[in-house]
Amino acid sequence: VPRWRQQWSGPGTTKRFPETVLARCVKYTEIHPEMRHVDCQSVWDAFKGAFISKHPCNITEEDYQPLMKLGTQTVPCNKILLWSRIKDLAHQFTQVQRDMFTLEDTLLGYLADDLTWCGEFNTSKINYQSCPDWRKDCSNNPVSVFWKTVSRRFAEAACDVVHVMLNGSRSKIFDKNSTFGSVEVHNLQPEKVQTLEAWVIHGGREDSRDLCQDPTIKELESIISKRNIQFSCKNIYRPDKFLQCVKNPEDSSCTSEI
């Protein structure tokens, strides 16, 4: 008799999830000498332990503490790049500007990037059929709690000038409900962080508007200023040229506005 299984609104666990996490861990620790001491089997066991046999709507930050401990990593606190709704460009940027880091450039972020996972209460099975959707089902699901935990910690790590890349093509350039807007903004430490500098990335070739004047950016400025952190904003009119100039800063065309 087939067992009744909870049907959630979101996609199920990414296929080959255990193998993917383990392979990513091995690859990361091979590339990053400072993380060579990490035992990837222990990392997978801790990851699995955070959600297996637990109700996927009842996950807590504490469930991820063993994984967080194993994934401890010192990040240069003045080289942090946050992003919202523009992950690909942020990652392209840190691939070129190797001394800067997004969360996905850390071990924990790298392990989980673009993956979905959940278990079932009282069984050791991984649910590959469906997982809770943040809006339709519950917010305390394994994926959301993981990203909330590591994002909070990443923001707390930041110091000096923190950069954030924002998508100028979206109706809400700054979205209070994004991970950046709901978690990272509120966990920057005013005693350590002097300035948050927003880079607003333009989508259209002929878009010459000053998107730093957008009402949602003004809202971000207000939130940041109230937290006693300075705010600055730059328009990135040509993201393609921006990346090119990061690669080749001596290029004569890179002196003009990007």
């Epitope: 994934g71 401890t72 240069p76 606190c77 910690r153 110091c159």
Partner: nanobody
């Protein structure tokens, strides 16, 4: 609950070496769960990170102070210390020892726990 307490002279002469100690209670200084550091706040200025030390013994120092700073740990006394050589009036500040939880991504600047601070004045 982890508690930190700074101790050391409140007055140091220019060109001399400043030496401060931080006593840790409520946790072991050699535990891999924590990392330790020093920060300071000159009068009317922002906090400044001086340096940190990890359970492995490795250290990170603020590049602008690196040539003058040493941070070390005494596990037998559950203490860690700061020495800052060749001090000038610009080193006058409230000095804080700090601790950080080692989990997830962390910065060099520990900020989960902090002592009450001790004022050090550099003057002849």
């Amino acid at each position: 609950q982890l508690q930190l307490q700074e101790s050391g002279p409140g007055l140091v002469k220019p060109s001399e070496t400043l030496a401060l100690t931080c006593n840790v209670s409520g946790g072991s200084i050699s535990s891999s769960s924590y990392y330790w550091g020093w920060i300071r706040q000159p009068p009317g200025k922002r906090l400044e990170w001086i340096g940190s030390i990890y359970h492995t013994g490795s250290t990170h120092y603020n590049p602008s102070l690196k040539s003058r700073v040493t941070i070390s740990v005494d596990t037998s006394k559950n203490q860690f210390s700061l020495t800052l050589s060749s001090v000038t009036a610009a080193d006058t500040a409230v000095y804080y020892c700090a601790g950080g939880d080692r989990y997830g991504p962390v910065g060099q600047w520990p900020s989960d726990y902090r002592g009450q601070g001790t004022l050090v004045t550099v003057s002849s």
